[in-house]
Interface confidence: low
């Protein structure tokens, strides 16, 4: 392919040319390329207009290209470029106009590029820049140059892993000129030892991240004091597990935060055993969101009412015991992936709406009611990936719940009462892999608003799916995979008229039945993969609901034997619904194992008597049918011949064609023959058939009996149309009954031989007879019309006044 | 397959091979070398990743004397405010890091331990590297 050795990811759009030892920019990629990855190639030098071949580029990755010099206008033609990545290039020389022409650049990544100063970085004209990442460089001064006042769209500035030690008042002066800037600033992993008090006074930042910046507790305290006056939406402090950490840490560390205005606070990774971590947060009582990530909290008093937090997040922390939570204003609590404190203890959170307690290995003695959480406002509850949860209450006081997730926890007492009876507002329920054994038909009673139900990986009494969904009239998604199901009630899904997706995969069904799905008139996706389906339950399978768009029957145990031939044929008939048909393979018999079901032609062997009787029967029936068929048309055509025998032919030719070729018939055939000299009169069904008369009768009486000849317009559409083939077959009979009749074949377009062979007679006739081929060129058209007129004039008595036919006693006419 | 030796300790010998086509160079040092009876030390890694390390996780396939243990997924980088500083490393950026480790009180029986480490990162997820570690364990006492 033209783009090789690069990889085409999205045709004409995305190309991956990573690590191909290119020394220059490739020139064999399309002009339309938008995403280009040239990383890990030894390009070394970028001259002017290096990328003129790619005017549409939006993303350009030049990571680790050993680039040392970038000349003026290297990217000059890239006015659409939004992302430029230069990570890991040892840049020695950067021309002042290196980034000129990048009028749409939003993201510039210059990580590990030997950058020693922002002052000399020529990006002042990049007004559209939103993200500047200059981490892992040699920058010593935090002075933001004057040109930053042009970067009015800047949202992210990453200066982490540099050499910044001090921050002075003058360093941030430019930010005072940009009060509307919504800047997130990352200064992590800089060896800070001094922040001048007042440096951040009256400065607004969206986010400030300071992790692993201080080599002692005193330095940390002093620097935090230096942040006084800062207004920050989100402040992230902490350390990294794999970097040098402070020797000690105590409750005075964060005292300086009282002088900041903070909306959201996060402490990320802190591995110290503190007497009582709560004392650390005296200056953070009024933040709206408070997060602890990977913090050791061995001993903790209660998180109590005097905190005004609305969102509390405790993630990946180590606890001695489950904390006591009494927070009046808290609306969201995320307590996930924590260790220790395995038993859930009641909390008192009267305003709580969102509660995520997932992945803690917690056990609940009795779940769930308002008293567990001290709230009646809860809308979202996630208890997934926990330990044993014993259901002892049906969510009394928690009627507002809309989202409930228990997946991969071990639910007990689920089939003893209607657990969800009061949850009439619940929209989403996940009880997948919860060791639930459904033995009670009222398990889902009360869930009248439920739209999504996931219950994969559970089990049912006797592996039978009963009528447990009767109240779930609004359900749109149902997952019953991996439930060891073998049978289902024929009416199990009758009330689910809104259901769109049904997953029945990974069960133990041996047969398929369409009956249970008859009421699912919104069903779009049905997944029956990974079962043991061999055959159908009933002899006659009906159709699935007409809304169905995807049917997955992959990885089943299809029995490709004569016994199941009707089922296999039914599967073939569903071809347009089936997904991944190549993974639908025969399981038995052994000689057909692994063969694709849809490409299989089963020739069925039966005993000789049955074959003999069958063949004889078929022959007799066939002969009778053929005789009746021939006799019927013989009589009809004969009757017509007697009726019209003494009269004149009204038409010179009856035209048989597919309605999809009507444009050609109207614009070419009719125009040239009826308006030409001599004029021919054609019989056309859209114009000359009598309304209200049966089509077959019209074809015979109006078409054949009143026409001298028949013109057959052969095309792909013609061969695929049953009506056309029907008309053509009558034409054959007509030719057979009236030896002088002439059929003129016009081949309108090259017809695929395989398609033509399906109509054996037509194939033979076209092989034996000369036919006219339509060719849309000046010379071709001329020859075509001359030959067609000649064929139609044959047997025609012409006078300029009108068209006179020769009646039923036609003269001999050659077929062309 | 070329075998890369890591280190020898009093009760173990550790080496690895690549189990992917890419075989991008990675330098692994353990100091002191791991002793399976109890160990504390530093793991030093030098590596230039071919994709961002954001959302890095390992799939671990452990075999003990030809017996396969269930696949284990170890999430290293969640995607924001991660524990390790290398989680913010970008494609092509040098990762040069030291990680401390310690474990104690685990009794391992004599034999050959294999651990396939599949590192997966990024969005969309793709394989970063794949290494197969072989630990030959010869305990002094069982």
């Amino acid at each position: 392919e033209s783009w090789e050795p690069c990889v085409e990811v999205v045709p004409n759009i995305t190309y991956q040319c990573m690590e191909l030892n290119f020394y220059k920019i490739p020139d064999n990629l399309p002009f339309s390329t938008k995403n280009l990855d040239l990383s890990f190639n030894p390009l070394r030098h970028l001259g002017s207009y290096s990328f003129f071949s790619f005017p549409e580029l939006q993303v350009l990755d030049l990571s680790r290209c050993e680039i040392q010099t970038i000349e003026d206008g290297a990217y000059q033609s890239l006015s659409h470029l939004s992302t430029l990545i230069l990570t890991g290039n040892p840049i020695q020389s950067l021309a002042l106009g290196a980034f000129s022409g990048l009028s749409s650049l939003q993201k510039l990544v210059a990580v590990e590029t030997n950058l020693a100063s922002l002052e000399n970085f020529p990006i002042g004209h990049l007004k559209t820049l939103k993200e500047l990442n200059v981490a892992h460089n040699l920058i010593q001064s935090f002075k933001l140059p004057e040109y930053f006042s042009n970067l009015t769209n800047l949202e992210h500035l990453d200066l982490s892993s540099n050499k910044i030690q001090s921050i002075y008042c003058t360093d941030l002066r430019v930010l005072h000129q940009m009060p509307l800037l919504n800047l997130s600033l990352d200064l992590s992993l800089n060896p800070m030892n001094f922040i001048q008090p007042g440096a951040f006074k009256e400065i607004r930042l969206h986010k400030l991240t300071l992790r692993n910046n201080f080599d002692s507790l005193n330095v940390m305290k002093t620097c935090i004091q230096g942040l006084a006056g800062l207004e920050v939406h989100r402040l992230v402090l902490g350390e990294f597990r794999n970097e040098g950490n402070l020797e000690k840490f105590d409750k005075s560390a964060l005292e300086g935060l009282c002088n900041l205005t903070i909306e959201e606070f996060r402490l990320a990774y802190l591995d110290y055993y503190l007497d009582d971590i709560i004392d650390l947060f005296n200056c953070l009582t009024n933040v709206s969101s408070f997060s602890l990530v990977s913090v050791t909290i061995e001993r903790v008093k209660d998180f109590s009412y005097n905190f005004g937090w609305q969102h509390l997040e405790l993630v990946n922390c180590k606890f001695g015991q489950f904390p006591t939570l009494k927070l009046k204003s808290l609306k969201r609590l995320t307590f996930t992936s924590n260790k220790g404190g395995n038993a859930f203890s009641e909390v008192d959170l009267p305003s709580l709406e969102f509660l995520d307690l997932s992945r803690n290995g917690l056990s609940f003695k009795g779940c769930c009611s308002q008293s567990d959480f001290g709230t009646t406002s809860l809308k979202y509850l996630d208890l997934s990936f926990n330990g044993v949860i014993t259901m002892s209450s049906n969510f009394l006081g928690l009627e507002q719940l809309e989202h409930l997730d228990f997946q991969h926890s071990n639910l007990k007492q689920m089939s003893e009462f209607s657990v969800f009876l009061s949850l009439r507002n619940l929209i989403y329920l996940d009880i997948s892999h919860t060791h639930t054994r459904v033995a009670f038909n009222g398990i889902f009673n009360g869930l009248s608003s439920l739209e999504v139900l996931k219950m994969a990986g559970n089990s049912f009494q006797e592996n039978f799916l009963p009528d447990i969904f009767t109240e779930l009239r609004n359900l749109t998604f149902l997952d019953l995979s991996q439930c060891q199901l073998e049978q289902l009630s024929p009416t199990a899904f009758n009330s689910l008229s809104s259901l769109q997706v049904l997953n029945m995969s990974h069960n133990n069904f041996f047969s398929l039945d369409t009956f249970p799905y008859k009421c699912l008139n919104s069903l779009q996706v049905l997944d029956y993969s990974l079962n043991h389906i061999m055959t159908s339950k009933k002899q006659e399978l009906q159709h699935f609901p007409s809304s169905l768009a995807f049917l997955n029957l992959t990885q089943n145990d299809f029995a490709c034997t004569c016994e199941h031939q009707s089922f296999l044929q039914w599967i073939k008939d569903q071809r347009q619904l089936l997904v991944e048909v190549e993974r639908m393979e025969c399981a038995t018999p052994s000689d057909k194992q692994g063969m694709p079901v849809l490409s299989l032609n089963i020739t069925c062997q039966m005993n000789k008597t049955i074959i003999g009787v069958s063949v004889l029967s078929v022959l007799v029936v066939s002969v009778v049918a053929v005789l009746v068929y021939k006799f019927y048309f013989h009589l009809m055509l004969l009757a017509g011949c007697i009726k019209y025998g003494r009269g004149e032919n009204i038409y010179d030719a009856f035209v048989i064609y597919s309605s999809q070729d009507e444009d050609w018939v109207r614009n070419e055939l009719v125009k040239n023959l009826e308006e030409g000299v001599p004029p021919f009169q054609l019989c056309l069904h859209y114009r000359d058939f009598i309304p209200g008369v049966a089509i077959a009768a019209n074809i015979i009486h109006e078409g054949f009996h009143k026409s001298r000849k028949v013109i057959v317009v052969v095309s792909q559409h013609f061969i695929q149309s049953r009506w056309c083939i029907f008309e053509y077959e009558i034409a054959q009979t007509w030719q057979f009954l009236s030896s002088r009749a002439g059929i003129i074949f016009i081949v309108l377009q090259k017809v695929e031989k395989t398609l033509l062979r399906q109509q054996v007679e037509l194939y033979r006739l076209l092989s034996r007879n000369t036919y006219l081929e339509w060719e849309d060129s000046v010379l071709g058209r001329h020859i075509f019309w001359r030959r067609l007129r000649k064929a139609l004039l044959d047997g025609k008595s012409w006078n300029p006044e009108g068209t006179v036919g020769t009646g039923c006693n036609w003269q001999e006419a050659t077929s062309i | 397959q070329k075998q890369y030796w890591v280190c020898n300790s009093s009760d173990a010998s550790i080496s690895y091979t690549y189990c992917d086509k890419m075989q991008y160079p990675i330098s692994i040092n353990v100091n002191p070398c791991i002793e399976l009876k109890r160990s504390k030390g530093l793991l030093h890694i030098f590596y230039i990743p071919r994709r961002d390390l954001k959302q890095l996780y390992f799939n671990l396939y452990i075999t003990v004397n030809t017996m396969n243990l269930p696949k284990r997924k170890e999430v290293i980088c969640r995607g924001s405010d991660d524990d390790y500083s290398f989680c913010r490393a970008l494609k092509g950026e040098t990762v040069n890091t030291t990680i401390s480790f310690s474990f104690k009180g685990i009794k391992f029986s004599k034999g050959k331990y294999k651990c396939v480490v599949e590192a997966i990162s990024g969005s969309p997820e793709e394989m970063l590297f794949c290494l197969e570690f072989v630990i030959l364990h010869q305990p002094n006492s069982n």
């Epitope: 608003s449 739209e451 999504v452 998604f477 809104s498 919104s522 768009a549 995807f550 | 969309p124």
Partner: antibody
Framework: QVQLQQSGADLVRPGALVKLSCTAS????????IHWVKKRPEWGLEWIGW????????IYDPRFQGKASITADTSSNTAFLQLTSLTSEDTAVYYC?????????????WGQGTTVTVSS | QIVLTQSPSIMSASLGEEITLTCSAS?????MHWYQQKSGTSPKLLIY???NLASGVPSRFSGSGSGTFYSLTISSVEAEDAADYYC?????????FGGGTKLEIK
């Protein structure tokens, strides 16, 4: 942050076809549905269909069946809309939008729109 | 398919006024989403699932309704609320939008 970046405007001839792209950033398209919506001047919004990139499913409004084809490439986090046999009726702004969290949430983020003009 | 009819098709309101836009469905739907589209911009999610406010949407917007009748209320109209408003159902296939209500500020 979550963004959907659509391809630029297209001027196409009647009878031709056009393929629009929608590149997502800030989230993985495998975790959501990507919808396509049509907006003609002086008309309201018309839903064309959605794709579920994780399961490689696409569903269409019957009015657009045969006219539209929605696909996704999860490796580049991009969804595509291909329109065939274009007529003046297809002149419109086409938006892609994220349908969040499975089958029941609304379209919470939209692309900036791609203007398709069908003209000879 | 379910047809959503929005009324009025054009509405004029004064600053500070409370207004209600309605959307009726040809047959019952489970819930309704509402979108706002200002001139020359993409639509923006306003209300999801009948009454939930999308993030960043001012609290002056509220939604209600059930069955075949749904409404969007703006408690105190501001100049920036001038836009087209569309209701949208995603509970019955194919998913449909209303014809829209154009809100003009006097």
């Amino acid at each position: 942050q979550v963004q959907l970046q659509q391809s630029g405007a297209d001027l196409v001839r009647p009878g031709a076809l056009v393929k629009l792209s929608c590149t997502a950033s800030g989230f993985n398209i495998k975790d959501s549905y990507i919808h396509w919506v049509k907006k003609r001047p002086e008309w309201g919004l018309e839903w064309i269909g959605w794709t579920d990139p994780e399961n490689v499913n696409s569903i269409y409004d019957p009015r657009f069946q045969g006219k539209a084809s929605i696909t996704a490439d999860t490796s580049s986090n991009t969804a595509f809309l291909q329109l065939t046999s274009l007529t003046s009726e297809d002149t419109a702004v086409y938006y892609c939008a994220r349908g969040y969290n499975g089958v029941y949430y609304a379209m919470d983020y939209w692309g900036q729109g791609t203007t398709v003009t069908v003209s000879s | 398919q379910i047809v959503l009819t929005q009324s009025p098709s054009i509405m004029s309101a004064s600053l500070g006024e409370e207004i209600t836009l309605t959307c009726s469905a040809s047959s019952s739907v489970i819930y309704m989403h509402w979108y706002q589209q200002k001139s020359g911009t993409s639509p923006k999610l306003l209300i999801y699932r009948t009454y939930n406010l999308a993030s960043g949407v001012p609290s002056r917007f509220s939604g209600s309704g059930s069955g075949t009748f749904y409404s969007l209320t703006i408690s105190s109209v501001e100049a920036e609320d001038a836009a087209d408003y569309y209701c949208h159902q995603w509970s019955s296939f194919p998913y449909t939008f209303g014809g829209g209500t154009k809100l003009e500020i006097k």
